[in-house]
């Protein structure tokens, strides 16, 4: 077992006066046994903020069930923050003994009494949309102070201009929220695209927060179909392929119909991915023309991502192929599943 480390993931925490500050601390091991204590400041004059083992700390609550042996989260919440609470807080692990001995300290979390915006959350439309459609994305960030804040939208690094932003409330408040809606026109090449909402605030020291949305979760690129007849593979057998190109997402079901009757249904599995993130897929049907007296209308029907089916047909001439005596079967195969259906 590796030696225990005390992890304080936040180098700094900024909190508005009157609110609660959560100071995160986790340990990487359950060994050694012993209490956790929180201090403000370092050295002999450090101030005890919380002792897991004993004492009364009315403003401090533990975030998780810290009395249990399996607990590794020793984060605390300090209520009713005032400017006097500013400082660096250390989470310190002790080894059980008489007396308990200090084992390891976290790196510290600096608490400043002002408020950063929360990480921007970008959300897109509930339903997918197809290229050439305009969709709306929203970006929200909360809990910041002071009120002055800058929000920008980007698509693949290019700044967008069609958006509206509101900061609430209008009057004085302990903290503020920002809400912005941007309009984005989808293109067929947007599967790999990202929409980014960037928030800059004085508390962020010039390092803006970003929220992202992948257009892969928003876009639907419908497939194009092409049905072609391949050269005859063997006597009386014709290979017909249906090329399904440039579709996204992958969820696709293909049905072959012979003269309007369902011949086979399959789901796209082994697809190839294009550079733009869309997919191609090919299905093929081996038709025994000797099983047909008349011309055959072969139809490739595709249902993509739950949308209404699209289809493409191909007329197969059988007049040049006299039917063999005693045969009334059609053999069908897929490239990955060689089987005859009688």
């Amino acid at each position: 077992e590796e030696e225990l480390q005390v992890i304080q993931p936040d180098k700094s925490v900024s909190v508005a006066a009157g609110e609660s500050a959560i100071l995160h601390c986790t340990v990487t091991s359950l060994i050694p046994v012993g209490p956790i204590q929180w201090f403000r400041g370092a050295g002999p004059a450090r101030e005890l903020i919380y002792n897991q083992k004993e004492g009364h700390f009315p403003r401090v609550t533990t975030v998780s069930e810290s009395t249990k042996r399996e607990n590794m989260d020793f984060s605390i919440s300090i209520s009713n923050i005032t400017p006097a609470d500013a400082g660096t807080y250390y989470c310190v692990k002790f080894r059980k003994g008489s007396p308990d001995t200090e084992f390891k300290s976290g790196a510290g979390t600096e608490l400043s009494v002002r408020a950063k915006p929360s990480a921007p959350v970008v959300s897109g439309p509930a339903a997918r949309a197809t290229p050439q459609h305009t969709v709306s994305f929203t970006c929200e960030s909360h809990g910041f102070s002071p009120r002055d804040i800058t929000l920008k939208w980007f698509k693949n690094g290019n700044e967008l201009s069609d958006f509206q932003t509101n900061v609430d409330p209008v009057g004085e408040s302990v903290s503020y929220s920002i809400h912005s809606t941007a309009k984005v026109v989808l293109t067929r090449e947007d599967v790999h695209s990202q929409v980014i909402c960037e928030v800059a605030h004085v508390t962020l020291q010039g390092d803006p927060l970003r929220g992202t949305a992948n257009l892969s979760e928003t876009i639907r690129v419908p497939p194009t179909l092409e049905v072609t007849q391949q050269p005859v593979r063997a006597e009386n057998q014709v290979n017909v392929t249906c090329q399904v190109r440039k579709f996204y997402p992958q969820r696709l079901q293909l049905t072959w119909l012979e003269n309007g009757n369902v011949s086979r249904t399959e789901t796209a599995s082994t697809v190839t991915e294009n550079k733009d993130g869309t997919y191609n897929w090919m299905s093929w049907l081996l038709v025994n023309v000797s099983a047909h007296r008349d011309d055959v209308k072969l139809t490739c029907q595709v249902e993509h991502d739950g949308q209404p089916a699209v289809s493409k047909s191909h007329d197969l001439k059988v007049s040049a192929h006299p039917k063999e005596q005693g045969s009334n079967t059609a053999a069908e195969n897929t490239g990955s599943n060689e089987r005859n259906i009688y």
Epitope: L30, V33, G34, P35, E54, T67, R69, K96, P99
Partner: antibody, heavy 118, light 107 residues
Framework: EVQLVESGGGLVQPGGSLRLSCAAS????????MHWVRQATGKGLEWVSV???????YYPGSVKGRFTISRENAKNSLYLQMNSLRVGDTAVYYC????????????WGQGTMVTVSS | DIQMTQSPSSLSASIGDKVTITCRAS??????LAWFQQKPGKAPKSLIY???SLQSGVPSKFSGSGSGTDFTLTISSLQPEDFATYYC?????????FGQGTKLEIK
């Protein structure tokens, strides 16, 4: 519900062996130190052994070299292999979870009786 | 090994009484002391850990105090179900050791 259930007790002759089991349920077994405690009839409690979450073990002098504690986290099971048994080992054996952050016992099993007699 | 000595060994009290049991360690154990209750034919039940912290589900009529070598368990108002044997235990270092027990009987 957090539960510990001991089994494997019985009558054994002096010098014989016995293996006790403790089946744990209702908690993340691998995250707790586990202990065996025994109690002779009409007597007090005596701590017998511990196995830590990392597999480290400790015993008092009275059983050291004769008893072996082990655990099988995948089966949520604790064991006590008792060899070279003596009449003085006759007792009810309890398994207990070091369930508090400081390894204080919080949950006990119902116990299993071990009788060493010729 | 750390020796734990309980007193008294037995105690008679009436319903509603407040009783105190003491436990002394042969050396400083900080506050790594637990108290257990045991009724005849039953497994021990955990009451208190780190000298004064109540285990989950234990009624607040039980309280513990002390640090170093001297500790006490107090039951504020005895009820019939409280008559049992009580044990203290140090768990600051191995081997963990128990007191010899205090039998609390109805007067």
């Amino acid at each position: 519900e957090v539960q510990l259930v001991e089994s494997g007790g019985g009558l054994v002759q002096p010098g014989g062996s016995l293996r006790l089991s403790c089946a744990a349920s209702g908690f993340t077994f691998s995250s707790y130190d586990m202990h065996w405690v025994r109690q002779a009839t009409g007597k007090g409690l005596e701590w017998v052994s511990v196995i830590g979450i990392a597999g480290d073990t400790y015993y008092p002098g009275s059983v050291k070299g004769r008893f072996t504690i082990s655990r099988e986290n995948a089966k949520n099971s604790l064991y006590l292999q008792m060899n070279s048994l003596r009449v003085g080992d006759t007792a009810v054996y309890y398994c207990a979870r070091g369930g508090s952050w400081d390894d204080a016992f919080d949950i006990w099993g119902q116990g299993t009786m071990v009788t060493v007699s010729s | 090994d750390i020796q734990m000595t309980q007193s008294p060994s037995s105690l008679s009290a009436s319903i509603g009484d407040k009783v105190t049991i003491t436990c002394r360690a042969s050396q400083d154990i900080n506050n790594y002391l637990a108290w257990f209750q045991q009724k005849p034919g039953k497994a021990p039940k955990s009451l208190i850990y780190t000298a004064s912290s109540l285990q989950s589900g234990v009624p607040s009529k039980f309280s513990g105090s002390g640090s170093g070598t001297d500790f006490t368990l107090t039951i504020s108002s005895l009820q019939p179900e409280d008559f049992a044997t009580y044990y203290c235990q140090q768990y600051v270092s191995y081997p963990y050791t128990f007191g010899q027990g205090t039998k609390l009987e109805i007067k």
